[in-house]
């Protein structure tokens, strides 16, 4: 049929919870492009109708609850003006969550089960949750060795867990838990981790690398709305913290009360070698205040920002 | 290193109950599951149950449930399995196991309890 | 519950040889949740084989696993002496957990 066929790594997943894939493939999917996805080589198409317990929603394929039935080899196949690729998804169910029982439990930990916490330092854990727009999805909570987190060391930020002061005691089994509204219905997320302590100042000394923003200006005009992307490239298995700041605060903190700017959710695309995550910040409308400073891109060590200027006057207008 | 290290051999006689320590050291106590299991004498590993010793969570095996009773102590690493309404069958070797997490597998052993029970 | 089933019951063969011990379940089971162990008299068990073809720690590679579905095996390429113990095969895929009865392997 003339499809070039790419085989992505094998996703394990839990059982009685909701679970989505992107049929995302950068470049292919960047363009226009048409997304079908299919079940084990089957002629037909995967549902679209949002009633169904498994459907395509957009380029994703979702399913609300997987069930353990629903393992096998899932393709999507992309189809542009001049090309065909087919995506090849190997699905493993596991029945049950560890802190339930340890029978029919998670074998062989992929990358995203795996996070690691760098002692006396700052850090933080992500909760991956992958969801299309269609799915809403409740605060996070953070559990350690099957019991709720709470300390004055740990917060919670949108997907992440801050942990202050790492200590060799915050390794462990983690899990973090959600509530996902699809139609109206509510059904739980629960995600293990296992988190190892590291001394390591990095991952294998390896730096995230900001691809934008540039340490540039943008010019932009007073009163308008504005989203900036900050894209960082950084290796599979890291955990450092991807955030927007400003005089060194959190965004989300330094305008909690107006909420005029904020950091949008996180998302991540992956790469064989690397994942490439983009965090934006919205300006919902852009004040006198807002020019002169530095919004600060933060990705582990790594630091870029951007400078709001007014657009320099267009003499044509008069 | 990683060790489990169980209670010395007992002798019950029939209806009453034993209780058997685990004390482990050199991992994270209440990172693993703790999986009990049963050999009597001549005879094959038959499951009696887990216990998750952080939420104290336990699973039995339907044959054993209502006897047998997991606990725990974390403040000294020790994990408890209790056998109650002893009978002449429950003459056995009793192993305590740990599951790691994304290991579903038993790679370390306590060396073993032997209970008997006799009149 | 999953019955798991060993044959032969007891293997007699000499130092040198191969032995091919076999384990079959009443229902499918999982790749990930198929293990071996070994047992020798007044010792604990110790894991042999996990995940129907991974070898625990410290393991020679003259042991090695295989097999999918209902029928495992275990296999020692070339016995020595100390190979000589009862083992079992185990499924954690579901409650109850259970064992094979278990395969003595005696010196001939």
């Known amino acids: 049929d003339g499809c070039k066929d790419i085989f992505m790594k094998n996703e394990i997943l839990s059982a009685s919870q909701p679970f989505a894939f992107n049929c995302t493939f950068p470049p292919i999917t960047s363009g226009e492009v048409s997304v079908t996805w299919y079940k084990n080589s089957s002629k037909i198409p995967v549902s679209k109708i949002i009633q169904s317990r498994i459907h395509q929603d957009e380029t994703w394929i979702l399913f609300l609850p997987m069930e353990w039935g629903d393992s096998g080899v899932y393709q999507c196949v992309i189809k542009g003006r001049d090309s065909c690729h087919r995506i090849h998804v190997n699905l493993t169910v596991f029945e049950k969550h560890w802190c339930d029982t340890s029978i029919g439990g998670l074998p062989n930990l992929s990358d995203e089960y795996k996070q690691i916490l760098h002692l006396g330092k700052d850090d933080s854990l992500t909760c991956h949750l992958h969801f299309p727009k269609s799915c809403v999805l409740g605060p996070i909570k953070w559990y350690k060795d099957c019991n709720e987190i709470k300390g004055e060391r740990f917060t919670v930020l949108e997907t992440r867990l801050l942990v202050s002061n790492v200590s060799a005691e915050d390794r462990g089994n983690y899990a973090c838990q959600a509530i996902l509204t699809h139609s109206g219905k509510q059904y739980e997320v629960l995600n293990g981790i296992t988190v190892s302590i590291t001394e390591r100042a990095g991952y294998g000394g390896s730096v995230p690398k900001i691809i934008y923003p540039k340490n540039h200006s943008i010019e932009v005009q007073l009163g308008t709305t504005l989203i900036v992307d900050c894209n960082v490239t950084d290796t599979k298995d890291n955990t450092n913290l991807r955030c927007w700041r400003v005089n060194n605060t959190l965004v989300d903190d330094y305008y909690d009360e107006s909420k005029r700017i904020r950091e949008g959710v996180e998302t991540h695309v992956s790469f064989r070698e690397h994942n490439l995550y983009t965090v934006n910040i919205t300006f919902l409308e852009v004040k006198m205040e807002d020019y002169g400073l530095p919004f600060m891109c933060h990705a582990g060590v790594s630091t870029a920002y951007i400078i709001l200027q007014l657009p320099a006057p267009d003499f044509r207008a008069y | 290193q990683v060790q489990l290290v169980q209670s010395g051999a007992e002798v019950k006689k029939p209806g009453a109950s034993v209780k058997v320590s685990c004390k482990a050291s050199g991992y994270t106590f209440t990172s693993s599951w703790m999986h009990w299991a049963k050999q009597a004498p001549g005879q094959g590993l038959e499951w009696i149950g887990e216990?998750?010793?952080?939420?104290?969570?336990?699973n039995y095996n339907q044959k054993f449930q209502g006897r047998v009773t997991m606990t725990r102590d974390t403040s000294i690493s020790t994990a408890y399995m209790e056998l109650s309404r002893l009978r002449s069958d429950d003459t056995a070797v009793y192993y305590c196991a740990r599951v790691d997490y994304g290991k579903p597998w038993f790679a370390y052993w306590g060396q073993g309890t032997l209970v008997t029970v006799s009149s | 519950q999953i019955v798991l089933t060993q044959s032969p019951g007891t293997l007699s063969l000499s130092p040198g040889e191969r032995a091919t011990l076999s384990c079959r379940a009443s229902s499918s089971v999982s790749s990930s949740y198929l293990h071996w162990y070994q047992q020798k008299p007044g010792q604990a068990p110790r894991l042999l084989i996990y995940?129907?073809?991974s070898r625990a720690t410290g393991i020679p590679d003259r042991f090695s696993g295989s097999g999918s579905g209902t029928d495992f095996t275990l296999t020692i390429s070339r016995l020595e002496p100390e190979d000589f113990a009862t083992y079992y095969c185990q499924q954690f895929q579901s409650s109850p957990l259970t064992f094979g009865q278990g395969t003595k392997l005696e010196i001939k």
């Open positions: 216990i998750h010793p952080n939420s104290a969570k336990t």
């Open positions: 995940s129907t073809s």
